[in-house]
């Protein structure tokens, strides 16, 4: 808390300008009017105030707006945003994408802080859903943003927003998240032709069911091994050797290097050895010839 002291003669600030940068804490407190500060917030960001000085300016705004800052002030906070706590931000009502962008720009280079997470949460809740422009903005600043959301939160993403998603935005998504995103992507890209569709859907295939993988295998897509290794194990297991061969195309040779890793390992265990041998890759571990495979899960379902 800054002690209340009278402003020295001639030091009263008539505007927010560079003459304030060497004001001491108590001088800023005494000589800068909070209402003046609020109307000239855009100037604060052009002046290299120290952290100590920013603390004083924040204190003045807090006194002026105890219920939370208006958006006209929030939009121009600049580096002062770094001084805000999640509790401060929960009092705000941020509706403009421009305001969001301005504050994310200030935080650029930082990890997603609790302040930023709170700001985004307030903004998205206010909008009711993650629309394309918002998602575009958020993933531009934080490529991992999408994967930080819970499956429940992802369910509010409209399919139209999926067009904003880049492959790197999905790098840290787990299967539960891709399970939610894949159907949205399928819907979003449904009017594209085969090869273009595959390019767009590829990053989302970690959420694809068996029947969609079977359909892709009929389209000469030549899936790379990195994508194949991210597929759901339960979706890969029912695929036949012929289907996997068609799905991977020339990349099928890469299965040998991955034969000890899921889902390839588990898939091999489900295939007949003589079918695996047709690939000529030396894959071992399939079901020996003459053995009968009983699918107990299917039996249980029938009974």
């Amino acid at each position: 808390e800054v002690e209340k002291t009278a402003c020295p003669s001639g030091k009263k600030a008539r505007e927010i300008d560079e003459s304030l940068i060497f004001y001491k804490k108590w001088e800023l407190e005494a000589c800068v009017d909070a209402a003046l500060l609020a109307t000239q917030m855009d100037r604060v960001n052009a002046i290299p105030f120290t952290y100590e000085q920013l603390d004083v300016l924040k204190h003045k705004l807090d006194e002026l707006y105890p219920q939370g800052y208006p958006e006209s002030v929030i939009q121009h906070l600049g580096y002062l945003f770094l001084k805000m706590s999640p509790e401060d931000i929960r009092k705000w009502n941020v509706t403009s994408l421009e305001t969001l962008k301005a504050l994310l720009e200030v935080n650029k280079g930082h990890e997603m802080s609790p302040q930023v997470a709170t700001l985004i949460d307030r903004f998205v809740k206010g909008r009711g859903q993650l629309d394309k422009d918002t998602l575009d903005t958020l993933t531009a600043f934080y490529p991992g943003y999408l994967c930080s959301l819970s499956p429940e939160e992802l369910s509010s993403v409209p399919p139209s927003s999926i067009w904003a998603v880049r492959p790197q935005d999905l790098d840290t998504c787990d299967p539960r998240q891709l399970d939610v995103l894949y159907p949205k992507a399928r819907l979003a890209f449904q009017n594209m032709n085969g090869s273009e569709y595959f390019v767009k859907i590829q990053s989302f295939l970690g959420g694809a069911p068996t029947e969609d993988l079977k359909a892709l295998s009929q389209q000469n897509v030549s899936m790379d091994l990195a994508t194949f290794m991210k597929l759901r194990t339960d979706a890969v297991l029912p695929l036949t050797v012929a289907e996997v061969q068609k799905l991977l195309g020339p990349h099928v040779e890469g299965l040998k290097a991955e034969e000890r890793h899921r889902p390839v390992r588990d898939w091999i265990l489900r295939q007949r050895q003589d079918d695996l041998d047709t690939l000529g890759l030396g894959l071992q571990g399939g079901i020996p010839n003459g053995y009968l495979v009983l699918d107990l899960s299917m039996q249980e379902a029938l009974s």
């Epitope: 560079e18 003459s19 940068i21 060497f22 960001n45 052009a46 002046i47 290299p48 105030f49 120290t50 952290y51 100590e52 000085q53 603390d55 600049g78 580096y79 770094l82 930082h110």
Partner: antibody
Amino acid sequence: QVQLVESGGGLVKPGGSLRLSCAASGFTFSDYYMSWIRQAPGKGLEWVSYISSSGSTIYYADSVKGRFTISRDNAKNSLYLQMNSLRAEDTAVYYCASTSRRCTFQHWGQGTLVTVSS
Amino acid sequence: IQLTQSPSSLSASVGDRVTITCRASQGISSALAWYQQKPGKAPKLLIYDASSLESGVPSRFSGSGSGTDFTLTISSLQPEDFATYYCQQFNSYPLTFGGGTKVEIK
């Protein structure tokens, strides 16, 4: 890309004067606060002087106050340091640096050596 | 505000994990930057706000700390990392630097 090039350094006798210049390019010079920072041989860094973007607000370290004058010409993208009444302890490499909004020194020149000796 | 760096010098080998500390004479929040200076060259900004990596700086450099105690860590020292490192506070004017830590080849 951003470039800061200092000039004007050299050998001067105690009590003498020198004028350092810093030519800036690759960024909007008039938007930036600029600093002079010096480094005595084998020693650390000392913030010597600071000038606001318009040139109206200036700072000097106590060690140079009254002897050094910082100025800028935004039309010429240039920063200056007029050094008078030089002392042996002013011997150093002098760097000009752009000062970010966070008060860090973002871009530096290569430095110019000032030697004060009789 | 005075900044005290320790150690003033250290010897290390390529691949070593190196830690340099900077202590402020009073609390400075996270208003601390780290610079690298190679012989005959100007300093280069590595880290600002105590832990944020400047654009283009390798991820083996990291910063931590808040208040009075700060650390610069190089996770796996590379040949080009042998240099002198300085901390700088920007919590209040005048802006000040630490005395430097020289990282030499063992």
